[in-house]
């Protein structure tokens, strides 16, 4: 139970980070114009990964497009690009899990094809989430050097007779939002991740250690193994999986190919 | 027709109080941001205040600050300037004007005078 | 605040004739966002309030003659009239609607001969 509600949730929670970093990646407010300290202007600018608007105190709002490709700052380019991959993998690995989902039966897909789409989908939700976190800081990153280059020549003017007010920006939501998205994405993912040990079937043999008593013997064997009466064929110590007996916290309790995660 | 009729103007006591109101019709009154506007006897604009679309945003000139207050009533398609601590320096004729593209000020009033005077 | 300067203050025509009138604002009304200058003129008639001519510095309002021209960037704005009618006779002012207070011009008027 523990697994499924582990990868369940991870699901979900991956499921909402990449809804936010889609969210963010499209949103217009990645900076905005900084009021602070600045006079008060009867217009508010705002830039966005794709467009940059303009809303007047009218209400009217005017946005523009970039119809440049090259003419783009490289950094501006970077952070599209970290933000669609995000986006991308983020979008196979919920395609991924979904299948994964102990919940889900399809066919007779084995746990261990689960377990293994368990992982890949963690995996991409994890480097998705840090797509976004890492495209998002960037961006800000850009913000904040930006900000103290134009506070340093915040008025500039033909011999201090005419001014010309810089446009600073400042934080936009969108970076809270691809923040927080991004950072459940990879909640998300890691979640994922814990989950595939749970569902990882059993591959190590333990060696049985047989008591024999006179007349009746019980080979004793530990979880992964059925106990058996006599001197049958089970006394040759194979595994037996048992996939609906055990509890999810034994599963997790044995070593399996999945641990180096 | 886009209309904006202005009522509540008169001769005041200086330190006195005033309200004006401003009865638009012929477009969505709700949907636009308004303006006051005076102008004084030397026939000199001065833009006196601005209220949002939902009233909880307003912008002031400094002179009349503390003593002005601009408000609306979206549902009765009005929209009011209340004026306390009334100056001989107020005295001007009262235009409200609906703000358009460019915070323009594409319609105006027939203005209202208000008088400060002892 | 922001202060307008209007030049000359008044300006003595005849019809037919072309005129340009001047605004000087004391800081840029240039927005760096959309590279709008946000400066209107207005004409307004003895006895009547005013009317919108021009938005963003050079965009005619609808039903304006298209000899009323607005033009500039920056700080330096001009009107130009470019064939003046007797029905043009009247004060012509520009207001900043960039930064707040909105302030106004003290006008040109334009009288004819």
């Known amino acids: 139970m523990a697994v499924t509600a582990c990868q369940g949730l991870g699901f979900v929670v991956s499921l909402i980070g990449i809804a936010g970093i889609i969210a963010a990646t499209c949103m217009d407010q990645w900076s905005t114009q900084d009021l602070y300290n600045n006079p008060v202007t009867a217009v508010f600018n705002y830039q966005g990964l794709w467009r940059s608007c303009v809303r007047e105190s009218s209400g009217f709002t005017e946005c523009r497009g970039y119809f440049t490709l090259l003419g783009l700052p490289a950094m501006l380019q970077a952070v599209r690009a970290l933000m669609i991959v995000g986006i991308v993998l983020g979008a196979i690995g919920l395609l991924v899990s979904i299948f994964a989902l102990k919940c889900i039966r399809i066919g007779s897909m084995e746990d261990s094809a689960k377990a293994n789409m368990t992982l890949t989908s963690g995996i991409m939700f994890i480097v998705s989430g840090l797509c976004a976190i890492a495209g998002v800081s960037v961006f800000a990153n850009m913000l904040v050097t930006n900000f103290w280059m134009s506070t340093a020549n915040m008025y500039t003017g033909m011999g201090g007779m005419v001014q010309t007010v810089q446009t600073r920006y400042t934080f936009g939501a969108a970076l809270f939002v691809g923040w927080v998205a991004g950072g459940l994405t990879l909640i998300g993912g890691v979640m994922m991740c814990i989950a595939c040990r749970g569902l990882a079937p059993e591959e190590t043999n333990y060696k049985a250690v047989s008591y024999h008593a006179s007349g009746h013997s019980v080979a004793y064997k530990p979880g992964g193994f059925k106990a058996s009466t006599g001197f049958g064929s089970n006394t040759k110590n194979k595994k037996i999986y048992d996939g609906g007996a055990r509890t999810e916290d034994e599963v997790q309790s044995y070593p399996s190919k999945h641990d180096y995660v | 027709e886009i209309q904006l009729v202005e009522s509540g103007g008169g001769l005041v006591r200086p330190g006195g109080s005033l309200k004006l109101s401003c009865a638009a019709s012929g477009f969505s009154f709700k949907n636009y941001v308004m303006s006051w506007v005076r102008q004084s006897p030397e026939r000199r604009l001065e833009w006196v205040a601005e209220?949002?679309?939902?009233?909880?945003?307003?912008y002031y000139v400094d002179t009349v600050t503390g003593r002005f207050t601009i408000s609306r009533d979206n549902a009765k398609n009005t929209l009011y300037l209340e004026m306390t601590s009334l100056r001989s320096e107020d005295t001007a004729t009262y235009y409200c004007?609906?703000?358009?593209?460019?915070?323009?000020?594409?319609?105006w009033g027939q203005g209202t005078t208000l008088t400060v005077s002892s | 605040d922001i202060v307008m300067t209007q030049s000359p203050s008044s300006l003595t025509v005849t019809a037919g004739e072309k005129v340009t009138m001047s605004c000087k604002s004391s800081?840029?009304?240039?927005?760096?966002?959309?590279?709008?200058?946000?400066l209107t003129w207005y004409q307004q008639k003895p006895g009547q309030p005013p009317k919108l001519l021009i938005y963003w510095a050079s965009t005619r309002e609808s039903g304006v003659p298209d000899r009323f021209t607005g033009s500039g960037s920056g700080t330096d704005f001009t009107l130009t009239i470019s064939s003046v009618q007797a029905e043009d006779l009247a004060v012509y002012s520009c207001?900043?609607?960039?930064?707040?207070?909105?302030?106004f011009g003290a006008g040109t008027e334009l009288e004819l001969k």
């Open positions: 004007a609906r703000v358009g593209y460019g915070n323009s000020l594409d319609y």
């Open positions: 800081q840029s009304l240039l927005n760096s966002g959309n590279q709008k200058n946000y």
């Open positions: 209220i949002r679309t939902g009233g909880d945003y307003t």
């Open positions: 207001q900043n609607n960039y930064f707040y207070p909105l302030t």
